[in-house]
């Protein structure tokens, strides 16, 4: 029987941390080949609120598989200490927290959205990437628990979240709440009316949580979320009733309530006195058979577009409607017209309409070049949304500090590397968006004439960064073009 | 590491069994005493939702069922078999299943069982057929106590030690698998490419060699789905589990008169939660792997998995860089026409 707050706790803690650090130190060379590996173990087993015990117990069991790796005696000894130390220290933790042996909650692993890509990491002796990640996760999880036990005697005054609000556009759904935390953290749970609670955004100091992944599983379901408040550094602590404080959100049915995003006019084509106006079929984060559905796919004939059009020379507007994404309207010959569209879901009683699309006019380069760059940014945002639920671990050449005199060279590198995302995603909507973005950008670049820049870095001289950073830097350089166009 | 710490870890932390194998604490149901509705049944589930890590590696799982004129209770705990519990020795502590034995207690009916496989006190068994069977019998019915005043008979002792540490072909320690385990339940799964089991019980299989199994049956009256753990060395429903090494549960039809019968087995955690009927899987061997990947000029590849759908990356040799716009990714994919797996050709170019 060990006393975690006395000598034993210090011993075990120091042994654990020393051993973990020794192991991680001996594995510091490993990593360049472990590009954000998504192992199934970490999809199933997470160091969740009130499930730390189960995570660490399973992690300790998992560590034992690496005891016969024909590694040095020291390596094995440290592994054994971490594995067995974790198991024993769990029981100390259980006692100090006034429980019977560490309660694990239900032994039901969390499901992952991503399909198991047959990475049988537990059968691969040489998978040091997994071992390194496992040790890092064990260290993080222990730090969370030990921080909690040390500060257990501190005050546990927490404030319940309030003003829980759903912010959702084209099914991208974020729960927001107040207040900004002071000495407390939040965890969010979401469920359908009949389903189990699923935890998200663990111990966050943010006052928002992206729940898109959960709601897109069935957009016609009604969801409820709740936000738990925990004292910072003492997440095991609870309110006066023995439960952590929490507040429920209003119910949310994505199909009925998500806001319609601003539509975009994709093209217009005049033949005689008829003009065909096409609205871009906006992609959503709702998936079916591994591809992202468009707004039209999700809503079908429930979604209507209203077109406003007028002669460039006057202000008198006309309007037309369609339940496809195309309008065919009559115009006067020789006149230029301007267009704007609005999405509407007639069957709804609230949130029926989108904001109007940007105005597009005939007789001018579509929105001119500045508008092109604005559209490039919206395409980048779309790509960012689309890849969120994919696992693309590519690292891409990224110029994060572009000098204005090298912006065209840098832009060309970004456009080249964008094709890698398109290739590796294997997703039609990403492919289309990338293609569209490259056309827009090249059109705008060619408008500058053949600019020759000297003394600029080759793409291959740039640093390789992950996709998120790559896209952020890409947006910055596009903004540079907008500001100077 | 400070010497005193080093020592305490080495001495205290590592408990071994009689053969010197490292013994690890067990997972047991631990709800103490709770009211129960379990009565006149061959077996009952504990309905205890707390799975606990026993404090000491030597502890086993215990269940105590008591009935008096007023109520029925079920107690679930961890306990050290060297010490008596409710004044009785835990003589069946080495059993993998919790098979109830009646004990004499005045004024009440008192049954107790102990067992030493993870969460084994979740399913308590009263049925006679278990009580009379050989505890080391095949078929996974397992268990049974043998008397002997708390000492484990040598033949049982040996089987426990051998069972506990199972290794795979590479000599790596093999741990029990997590499977969905709801036995037979009615199902609405029909005419779908794949279905979820809708089984909310995830079980840690009793033996490390066991795999996950799902059985889908349809007759004129209903459809059922069975989810269990089972040893692939033994037939199940008279069929050999030939796909036991597959990471996915890909249904294959079996001939059974008067019903449509599909079965699959698999060996990744909870793999029998998603059962797959789709043709594209049925025609392919789920154990298909890719050959070594092609060589790419000035690049190397360190393959972590050769299994279908694995994604691996080439790395340019030192002094070379990936050409912008080219991808180092290769994926193990199936050529549906030939049913042969191959690596996709990366667009990678390595340049100086």
């Amino acid at each position: 029987d060990c006393d975690i707050e006395g000598k034993d706790g210090k011993q075990y803690e120091s042994v654990l941390m020393v051993s973990i650090d020794q192991l991680l130190d001996s594995m510091k060379e490993i990593g360049s080949n472990c590009l954000n590996n998504e192992f199934n173990f970490f999809k199933r087993h997470i160091c969740d609120a009130n499930k730390e015990g189960m995570f660490l117990f399973r992690a300790a069991r998992k560590l034992r598989q690496f005891l016969k790796m024909n590694s040095t005696g020291d390596f094995d000894l440290h592994l054994l200490k971490v594995s067995e130390g974790t198991t024993i220290l769990l029981n100390c933790t259980g006692q100090v927290k006034g429980r019977k042996p560490a309660a694990l909650g239900e032994a039901q692993p969390t499901k992952s959205l991503e399909e198991n890509k047959s990475l049988k990491e537990q059968k691969k002796l040489n998978d040091l990437c997994f071992l390194k990640r496992l040790l890092q996760e064990i260290k993080t999880c222990w730090n969370k628990i030990l921080m909690g036990t040390k500060e257990h005697s501190g005050t546990t005054n927490t404030v319940a979240a309030y003003n829980l609000t759903w912010k959702s556009t084209n099914f991208k759904t974020i729960l927001e709440w107040e207040p900004k935390p002071v000495n407390q953290v939040y965890t969010v749970q979401i469920s359908t009316k009949s389903g189990d609670w699923k935890s998200k955004c663990f111990y966050t100091t943010d006052t928002e949580c992206d729940l898109t992944d959960e709601i897109v599983k069935d957009v016609k379901q009604t969801y409820l979320a709740r936000v738990f408040s925990y004292p910072a550094g003492n997440v095991e602590s609870t309110g006066s009733a023995g439960e952590p404080l929490y507040e429920n959100s209003p119910e949310f049915t994505p199909y009925l309530e998500t806001n319609l995003g601003q539509p975009t006019i994709q093209s217009f084509e005049q033949v005689g006195t008829k003009v065909n106006v096409t609205v871009e079929d906006e992609r959503t984060l709702v998936r079916r058979n591994n591809t992202f559905l468009s707004l039209r796919d999700v809503f079908g004939k429930d979604l209507i577009y209203t077109l406003y059009y007028w002669k460039s020379s006057s202000s008198g507007k006309k309007t037309a409607k369609t339940n496809t994404n195309e309008f065919l309207i009559d115009v006067d010959k020789g006149e230029n017209y301007c267009f704007s569209v609005q999405a509407v879901i007639p069957s709804r009683t609230v949130n029926r309409k989108s904001t109007d699309s940007p105005v597009e006019c005939m007789g001018q380069e579509k929105g001119e070049f500045r508008e092109n760059w604005v559209n490039v940014i919206s395409d980048l945002k779309k790509i960012e949304d689309l890849i969120q639920s994919m696992h693309i671990d590519a690292t891409l050449y990224t110029e994060s500090d572009v000098h204005p005199s090298c912006k065209v060279t840098a832009m060309k590198c970004f456009l080249l590397e964008l094709q890698v995302i398109s290739l590796e995603s294997g997703d039609a909507s990403i492919h289309d968006t990338v293609e569209n973005l490259i056309i827009l950008a090249n059109n705008s670049l060619s408008s500058n004439g053949n600019v020759t820049e000297s003394g600029c870095k080759e793409c291959e001289e740039l640093e390789e960064k992950n996709i998120k950073e790559f896209l952020q830097s890409f947006v910055h350089i596009v903004q540079m073009f907008i500001n100077t166009s | 590491i400070p010497p005193h710490v080093q020592k305490s870890v080495n001495n205290d932390m590592i408990v071994t069994d009689n053969n010197g194998a490292v013994k690890f604490p067990q997972l047991c149901k631990f709800c103490d005493v709770r009211f129960s509705t379990c009565d006149n049944q061959k077996s009952c589930m504990s309905n205890c939702s707390i799975t606990s890590i026993c404090e000491k590696p030597q502890e086993v799982c215990v269940a105590v069922w008591r009935k008096n004129d007023e109520n029925i209770t079920l107690e679930t705990v961890c306990h050290d078999p060297k010490l008596p519990y409710h004044d009785f020795i835990l003589e069946d502590a080495a059993s993998p299943k919790c098979i109830m034995k009646e004990k004499k207690k005045p004024g009440e009916t008192f049954f107790m069982c102990s067992c030493s496989s993870d969460e084994c006190n979740d399913n308590i068994i009263f049925s006679e057929e278990y009580n009379t069977s050989n505890p080391d019998g095949g078929g996974g019915s397992g268990g049974g106590g043998s008397g002997g005043g708390g000492s484990i008979p040598p033949h049982v002792q040996k089987s426990v030690n051998n069972d506990m540490i199972v290794t795979d072909n590479n000599g790596a320690v093999k741990f029990p698998q997590l499977c969905k385990f709801c036995d037979v339940r009615f199902s609405t799964c029909d005419n779908q490419k794949s279905c979820m089991s809708n089984c909310s019980i995830t079980s840690i299989c009793e033996k490390p060699q066991e795999v996950c199994v799902a059985v889908w049956r349809k007759n004129d009256e209903n459809i059922t789905l069975e989810t269990v753990c089972h040893d692939p060395k033994l037939p199940y429903h008279d069929f050999i589990l030939e796909d036991a090494a597959s990471p996915k549960c890909i249904m294959k039809e079996k001939k059974k008169p008067g019903e449509t019968f599909f079965m699959c087995s698999c060996s990744s955690d909870e793999c029998n939660d998603n059962i797959i009927f789709s043709e594209e899987y049925n025609t392919s061997n789920p154990d298909i792997t890719c050959p070594p990947p092609m060589s790419v000029e000035h690049a190397d590849i360190w393959v972590k998995s050769y299994s279908l759908y694995s994604r691996e990356r080439y790395i340019c040799n030192s002094g070379f860089k990936r050409k912008a716009g080219t991808s180092s990714l290769t994926e193990c994919v199936l050529n549906k026409a030939t049913n042969v797996a191959h690596w996709t050709t990366p667009s990678l170019k390595c340049i100086r």
């Epitope: 037309a320 409607k321 609230v350 029926r352 | -």
Partner: antibody
Framework: QIQLVQSGGEVKKPGASVRVSCKAS????????VYWVRQSPGKGLEWIGY????????IYDQNFKGKATLTVDKSTSTAYMELSSLRSEDTAVYFC??????????WGQGTTVTVSS | DIQMTQSPASLSASVGDRVTITCLAS??????LAWYLQKPGKSPQLLIY???NLADGVPSRFSGSGSGTDFSFTISSLQPEDFATYYC?????????FGQGTKLEIK
């Protein structure tokens, strides 16, 4: 329940202006366009135009451009139609109606505007 | 502008009769058509929207059909309260024109 309540009848002299109001209740005002329709004595229905309270966009029939001006006050969920330069042929019943995109599902009770010297 | 031609302009029928009114659009309007009933001194009332859909609370004896340019409206069995004026309206493109109306009278 959903209601559109219009202001009372008006008698005006030729050349004058009149403002007819339509107060909406029982639904989210900015989510639905408000249509205005005219019915001259013994005649059929004529579409005047509509306003989208959400973005303030107005669409008019060519015949009513310069005659009718549509506005809204979102704070009171009220739509207004101002008719200017009134003539005797503007004598009619004026209706407001809620547009559900595919039809006009709720109508005001109508406001009679009489133009007479 | 799209013209809507409604016929007949008036119609006499008896209780229990089946009555059909037609509406012809001068160009295709898909199914963007609505039918209304109006009684003297009252506001119009929506009966059918999107050419074929019955509005809430409207009896099932009323029905609509058609798409493109040709539309019809049917009352399967006339009731005393059905004698009124009926209008079609296209809601496809502005101006959203009405038909000239069909007055249904008791024979």
């Amino acid at each position: 329940q959903i209601q559109l309540v219009q202001s009372g009848g008006e008698v005006k002299k030729p050349g004058a202006s009149v403002r007819v109001s339509c107060k909406a209740s029982g639904y989210s005002f900015t989510d639905y366009n408000v249509y205005w329709v005219r019915q001259s004595p013994g005649k059929g229905l004529e579409w005047i135009g509509y306003i989208d309270p959400y973005n303030g966009i107005t669409i008019y029939d060519q015949n009513f451009k310069g005659k009718a001006t549509l506005t809204v006050d979102k704070s009171t969920s009220t739509a207004y139609m101002e008719l200017s330069s009134l003539r005797s042929e503007d004598t009619a019943v004026y209706f407001c109606a809620r547009d559900v995109t595919t039809a006009l599902d709720f109508w005001g009770q109508g406001t009679t505007v009489t133009v007479s010297s | 502008d799209i013209q809507m031609t409604q016929s007949p302009a008036s119609l006499s029928a008896s209780v229990g009769d089946r009555v059909t009114i037609t509406c012809l659009a001068s160009q295709t309007i898909d199914t963007w058509l609505a039918w209304y009933l109006q009684k003297p001194g009252k506001s119009p009332q929506l009966l059918i929207y999107a050419a074929t859909n019955l509005a809430d609370g409207v009896p099932s004896r009323f029905s609509g059909s058609g798409s493109g340019t040709d539309f019809s409206f049917t009352i399967s069995s006339l009731q005393p309260e059905d004698f009124a004026t009926y209008y079609c309206q296209q809601v496809y493109s502005s101006p959203f024109t009405f038909g000239q109306g069909t007055k249904l009278e008791i024979k």
